[in-house]
């Protein structure tokens, strides 16, 4: 007897982080033998949607014409072939931005920082929130979470970076969120450009915009050092 059917691939276009009101298409790619594709959403009792395969039958399209809170969440897909159902795909986490007002992102003491020194990025929200996320543009692993302990609500989160190197230079934004849904984020803060200049020992000029290369430092997760801030938030990075 043949083994289990290979699991399909699940992805979203233009991406998995979508602003409120924008359209998104979820794709599930299986095999040419697929007869039906099914999309399941975590905590949804019935199959969330089901579609015929598109020719040549190896994938299906699930359209969301206008992103709302209801669509945010964790999805998996399956396909059915003449011999039965496939294994589930790896999960897709569809995140909606625009659920809350935008926070303010600032750098202390300044967004102009000398290599080797320290800087703290401060994300502040008007209303109390329990999760703050810092995102660096063009980083392969851009999310850094600070989540409050015991559900305590906070107006701000500090992201200390020490010692700063040229890798830390670039454009940052932050988001705020409530813990009851990791899939609903605020509008993004206005961008903050962190400019790292060379130290006395290292006088090389530092570019004011980070440039991502195929295997350059921008592809590494942002891992700032320093003590956990005193705001009652715990650091989580992905």
């Amino acid at each position: 007897q043949a083994g289990p059917l290979p699991k399909p691939t699940l992805w979203a276009e233009p991406g998995s982080v979508i602003s409120w009101g924008n359209s998104v298409t979820i794709w599930c790619q299986g095999t040419l033998e697929a007869r039906e594709y099914r999309l399941d959403k975590e905590e949804s009792p019935a199959p969330w949607d089901r579609q015929n395969p598109l020719e040549p039958k190896n994938k299906a399209r699930f359209s969301i014409p206008s992103m709302t809170e209801d669509y945010a969440g964790r999805y998996r897909c399956y396909y059915r072939s003449p011999v039965g159902w496939s294994q589930p795909s790896d999960p897709l986490e569809l995140v909606m931005t625009g659920a809350y007002s935008k926070p303010t992102l600032s750098a202390l003491p300044s967004p102009l920082v000398t290599s080797g020194k320290s800087v703290t990025l401060l994300c502040q929200s008007r209303s109390p929130m329990d999760t703050f996320l810092l995102i660096k543009e063009r980083a392969a692993h851009p999310l850094l979470h600070l989540r409050s302990e015991h559900g305590a609500q906070q107006h701000q989160a500090e992201f200390p970076m020490s010692p700063v190197t040229s890798v830390h230079g670039g454009t940052y934004r932050c988001f705020s969120s409530h813990g009851f849904s990791h899939y609903l984020l605020s509008h993004p803060s206005d961008p903050l450009e962190l400019i790292v200049s060379g130290s006395l020992e290292d006088p090389r000029p530092s570019p004011t915009r980070s440039v991502s290369t195929a295997a350059g430092p921008e592809d590494q997760p942002l891992m700032p050092t320093g003590s956990v801030p005193h705001s009652g938030l715990r650091r989580h990075w992905e």
């Epitope: 007869r35 019935a46 199959p47 969330w48 949607d49 089901r50 579609q51 209801d70 003449p82």
Partner: antibody
């Protein structure tokens, strides 16, 4: 006991619209898709489309895309089909049926059907 | 769309007979074939799903078989209450489609 309750009959004028209801009981309404099926007098069964009551996702038979609109009201566990621009061709019995969703993709419980007569 | 054909539109049989109703699909439907009974008053019930599985509460005199494009419903010992029209339906792809029905009458 699973029950799908539909009104017995509707008399409507040509060009008008009608909204048919199907009230579900005896199971968790949001856990099963709902189908709508048309049967003209003395004819076979035609699938109009299906709706997921938990999120409102729909799939339609292309033939009925401009004729029928499927909706649900979760608070009353009721599914609806609205038929617009009615003509004599729309005179038929309309059934709602619950989706079994497992092997077969069958419709395991059916309403009694609503007879729609289009006449001036 | 997949076309479902029930070539016999009506069938006469005697009580106690073994009756077979056939259904053909325009393409392989991978056993996603269901059978329904419609009584003269319009009531519709599911009898068999996935070719051969008996729906709950359906008498065991009903059975189904087939594969690929050809399927059949058998009533092993015809009873008066079985007088009805029988429809096949494919659940393999959207849109769902039905056969034209076979009306079963008593001789």
């Amino acid at each position: 006991e699973v029950q799908l309750q539909q009104p017995g009959a509707e008399l409507v004028k040509p060009g008008a619209s009608v909204k048919l209801s199907c009230k579900a009981s005896g199971y968790t309404f949001t856990s099963y898709w709902m189908h709508w099926v048309k049967q003209r007098p003395g004819q076979g069964l035609e699938w109009i489309g299906e709706i997921n009551p938990s999120n409102g996702r729909t799939n339609y038979n292309e033939k009925f895309k401009s004729k029928a609109t499927l909706t649900v009201d979760k608070s009353s566990s009721t599914a609806y089909v609205q038929l617009n621009s009615l003509t004599s061709e729309d005179s038929a019995v309309y059934y709602c049926a619950r989706d079994r969703y497992d092997e077969g993709n069958a419709m395991d419980y059916w309403g009694q059907g609503t007879s729609v007569t289009v006449s001036s | 769309d997949i076309v479902m054909t029930q070539t016999t539109s009506s069938l006469s049989a005697s009580l106690g007979d073994r009756v077979t109703i056939s259904c053909r699909a325009s393409q392989d439907i991978t056993n996603y074939l269901n059978w329904y009974q419609q009584k003269p008053d319009g009531t519709v019930k599911l009898l068999i799903y996935y070719t051969s599985r008996l729906h709950s509460g359906v008498p065991s005199r009903f059975s189904g078989s087939g594969s690929g494009t050809d399927y059949s419903l058998t009533i092993s010992n015809l009873e008066q209450e079985d007088i009805a029209t029988y429809f096949c339906q494919q659940g393999d792809t959207l849109p769902r489609t039905f056969g034209g029905g076979t009306k079963l009458e008593i001789k």
